[in-house]
Amino acid sequence: LRLLDHRALVCSQPGLNCTVKNSTCLDDSWIHPRNLTPSSPKDLQIQLHFAHTQQGDLFPVAHIEWTLQTDASILYLEGAELSVLQLNTNERLCVRFEFLSKLRHHHRRWRFTFSHFVVDPDQEYEVTVHHLPKPIPDGDPNHQSKNFLVPDCEHARMKVTTPCMSSGSLWDPNITVETLEAHQLRVSFTLWNESTHYQILLTSFPHMENHSCFEHMHHIPAPRPEEFHQRSNVTLTLRNLKGCCRHQVQIQPFFSSCLNDCLRHSATVSCPEMPDTPEPIPDYMPLW
């Protein structure tokens, strides 16, 4: 988790002087509770936005937006703590809005936004906005949280972001898999424009099970420049085992930008349809 660039982040708006500060996610008001605390944020919204760095790279960011409740507690609102928690790693990053002037009611509802948390493809986050100061130990909570799922690199807008392009998102191998006689699969895919090796990964499963009955890989050496964008054809020999008939084929590239952690593309071959065998007709009728 990180913030996009390190240029001065602003949270000021007409009628409010505000500065954005790094936060340890442990606001001072946890340790020194205040008697009077503001109410919680209202209408917290998280959306996927895209932003360029100063170097011109494009990253997905969490666009966080919320409004204030129209009650007198805004008189005691000193700022907000924004927290983003990546759920699969438990990594957390926080920033603090510090209000340098007192809020006053005005004809429009106060609205705040922040779009500088860089998020990763195919990850889920919990975004929390805490109004400051935080409540006393038994006080009503004054935060709001929402989960936010970032699409993977198959998503049209995500595909052209720097992290997705670095993992090979622009490569479309257009995999075709064909079942041949004698327990063989013919795999065909389009090579990318980089002299790097590939691996075809085959996992076979029984018809209705998810525990593999065969695992195999086939190494494809780095193509020469004249082979870039050409089709590569490989014939894989399957395990001759009745019922080991559902096959998942993955192509793993080893591009220089993502090394051994590049996006894999896959295709699946289902088990052949079994013809419905008619019920045998008994040649005698039981009498009971």
């Epitope: 691996q199 990964l201 996992t203 593999s212 065969f214 695992e215 195999h216 890989m217 395990r239 993955q250 793993q252 051994n260 952690d261």
Partner: nanobody
Framework: EVQLVESGGGLVQAGGSLRLSCAAS????????MAWYRQAPGKQRELVAQ???????NYGDPVKGRFTISRDNAKNTVYLQMNSLKPEDTAVYYC???????WGQGTQVTVSS
């Protein structure tokens, strides 16, 4: 938590032998396809040897006839026996479960002439 831990690397003279081990924890190696890769300084990671789930093996061209991949299911370990070592075999050797993209941290093999 899945861990692949390589061992057995070291310094050896050209023509000598080494046996690398890859011990798995949190993951059962039997019925799994496994591989060894290596990476020399400034070069791409390259395939050394592979074994599929039913024991068929495949080797990278530079090591064919000299290296042998095997596994011991009881010990949950994959081995790479390296004979007739050459200076160009100097690299960090990595154990890999390719279908799951599990990698070990690598073990250094240095072959002096």
């Amino acid at each position: 938590e899945v861990q692949l831990v390589e061992s057995g690397g070291g310094l050896v003279q050209a023509g000598g032998s080494l046996r690398l081990s890859c011990a798995a924890s949190g993951f059962t190696l039997s019925d799994r396809a496994m591989a060894w890769y290596r990476q020399a300084p400034g070069k791409q990671r390259e395939l050394v040897a592979q074994v599929n789930s039913i024991g068929s093996t495949n080797y990278g061209d530079p090591v064919k006839g000299r290296f042998t991949i095997s596994r011991d299911n009881a010990k949950n370990t994959v081995y790479l026996q390296m004979n007739s070592l050459k200076p160009e075999d100097t690299a960090v050797y990595y154990c890999n479960a390719p279908l799951y993209n599990y990698w070990g941290q690598g073990t250094q093999v240095t072959v002096s002439s």
